[in-house]
């Protein structure tokens, strides 16, 4: 799906101090979906503020969020997943600000896990594999993954590779010999559903072999 190409216009600046952002996670707990919202400004006094979602719900008109420290949270099976919901910040019965949001456009996948790297001596390459809970899901099954790796000494020099599978091969000759590397992976929805990058997986660290002087090849570890 092409979605909407951006033309550089800035989004609406909120007219008040209560601007917020939300993300949804589908089938995050069995068949339950979740919706998490938080204020953009961490200094907002949230003491009497509540969040409410209305519309595009099954069997009910509206649902109230639970407050968990600075975030507001719903876990439910009642998202219709078609049409726009109205999410409002409320104090008592008064709405301070509202947003019309289609929950299928603000999906944040769960972070990938079990990232590992195996060196194949005969092939002179590294096979990167990881897992994602989304392989078992019924809605957000198709993801784009972003694998990022760097030499440990290069603070901000990350190399990124985008892929749709959970397996990647890194050629040994593209990496520095006898170096320690850090690698991590994150995911974003890639078919119908839209939204945000997941959190990064925990990093995995691996060392590349020395160069074998006689053959010009790297030594395995």
């Amino acid at each position: 799906e092409s979605g909407y190409a951006q033309n550089g216009d800035l989004e609406d600046a909120e007219l008040d101090d209560y601007s917020f952002s939300c993300y949804s996670q589908l089938e995050v707990n069995g068949s339950q979906h979740s919706l998490t919202c938080a204020f953009e400004d961490p200094d907002v006094n949230i003491t009497n503020l509540e969040f409410e979602i209305c519309g595009a719900l099954v069997e009910v008109k509206c649902l109230n969020f639970r407050k968990l420290q600075e975030i507001y949270f719903i876990e439910t099976k009642k998202f219709l997943l078609i049409g726009k919901s109205n999410i409002c910040v409320k104090v008592g019965e008064k709405s301070l600000t509202c947003k019309k949001i289609d929950l299928t456009t603000i999906v944040k996948p769960e972070a990938p896990f079990d990232l590992s790297v195996v060196y194949r001596e005969g092939a002179n390459d590294f096979v990167v594999t990881f897992n994602t809970s989304h392989l078992q899901k019924k809605y957000v099954k198709v993801l784009m993954h972003d694998v990022a790796y760097r030499q440990e000494k290069d603070e901000n020099k990350w190399t990124h590779v985008n892929l749709s599978s959970t397996k990647l091969t890194l050629l040994q000759r593209k990496l520095q010999p006898a170096a320690m590397y850090e690698i991590k992976v994150r995911s974003i929805p890639d078919h119908y559903f839209k939204g945000f990058w997941s959190e990064w997986s925990p990093s995995y660290y691996f060392r590349t072999p020395e160069i074998n002087n006689s053959s010009g090849e790297m030594d395995p570890i």
């Epitope: 799906e1 092409s2 979605g3 909407y4 190409a5 951006q6 033309n7 550089g8 216009d9 989004e11 609406d12 595009a56 219709l80 997943l81 078609i82 049409g83 726009k84 019309k100 289609d102 299928t104 456009t105 019924k138 809605y139 119908y192």
Partner: antibody, heavy 118, light 111 residues
Framework: QVQLVQSGAEVKKPGASVKVSCKAS????????LHWVKQAPGQGLEWIGG????????AYNQKFKGRVTMTSDRSTSTVYMELSSLRSEDTAVYYC???????????WGQGTTVTVSS | DIVLTQSPDSLAVSLGERATINCRTS??????????MHWYQQKPGQPPKLLIY???NLESGVPDRFSGSGSETDFTLTISSLQAEDVAVYYC?????????FGGGTKVEIK
């Protein structure tokens, strides 16, 4: 009440351009995407593309890409569709329609007839 | 592009009788329980009007004699008891994949 009001009928020569407007009222303009749908005489419906008034982002049907441009003016709650290099097959009624969700159309304009004739 | 094939092309039904329109898609327009199929009614000289979204959800203000069902590639619009004002052309539309395509239409008349 929620309304989409389109500009009047147009008669154009082949090769010319036409710009049709659609003014929204009765709801917050930036809350909903607006799309354009073509209906040739006696024919069915064909999606041309849509625009998100909040960001100005557009999505076009590949068939019309390169000939269609959609813009929006938040100050007047109006969206525009410009179709260039007109040919006789472009003779049709053009509807603007609000997207109530992804991507179905819950409110429609009254339609604008565009006739392309030499 | 996803092709939507409606059947029949036209349908003549007695007042008070049931009218059934089918829409078949060239590939699935469902993601699990999310069915991205919608139905519209168009009367002569008027714009289309949304009746059903998400295969089975009745749009606000639409009489409940209209209902929708189906999943994957086969969908149905049913008018349980045809009224004179239901004479129109009915279109199905998918929204799983750009370009969002419509069926060719089914003309419903009174027998």
């Amino acid at each position: 009440q929620v309304q989409l009001v389109q500009s009047g009928a147009e008669v154009k020569k082949p090769g010319a351009s036409v710009k049709v407007s659609c003014k929204a009222s009765g709801y917050r303009f930036t809350d909903y995407e607006l799309h354009w749908v073509k209906q040739a005489p006696g024919q069915g419906l064909e999606w041309i593309g849509g625009i998100d008034p909040k960001t100005g982002g557009t999505a076009y049907n590949q068939k019309f890409k390169g000939r269609v441009t959609m813009t929006s003016d938040r100050s007047t709650s109006t969206v525009y569709m410009e179709l260039s290099s007109l040919r006789s097959e472009d003779t049709a009624v053009y509807y603007c329609a609000r997207s109530g969700g992804r991507w179905y159309f819950d409110v429609w304009g009254q339609g604008t007839t565009v006739t392309v004739s030499s | 592009d996803i092709v939507l094939t409606q059947s029949p092309d036209s349908l003549a039904v007695s007042l008070g009788e049931r009218a059934t329109i089918n829409c078949r898609t060239s590939e699935s327009v469902s993601i699990h329980l999310l069915h991205l199929m919608h139905w519209y009614q168009q009367k002569p000289g008027q714009p289309p009007k949304l009746l059903i979204y998400g295969a089975s959800n009745l749009e606000s203000g639409v009489p409940d004699r209209f209902s929708g069902s189906g999943s994957e590639t086969d969908f149905t619009l049913t008018i349980s008891s045809l009224q004179a004002e239901d004479v129109a052309v009915y279109y199905c539309q998918q929204s799983i994949k750009d370009p969002y395509t419509f069926g060719g239409g089914t003309k419903v008349e009174i027998k």
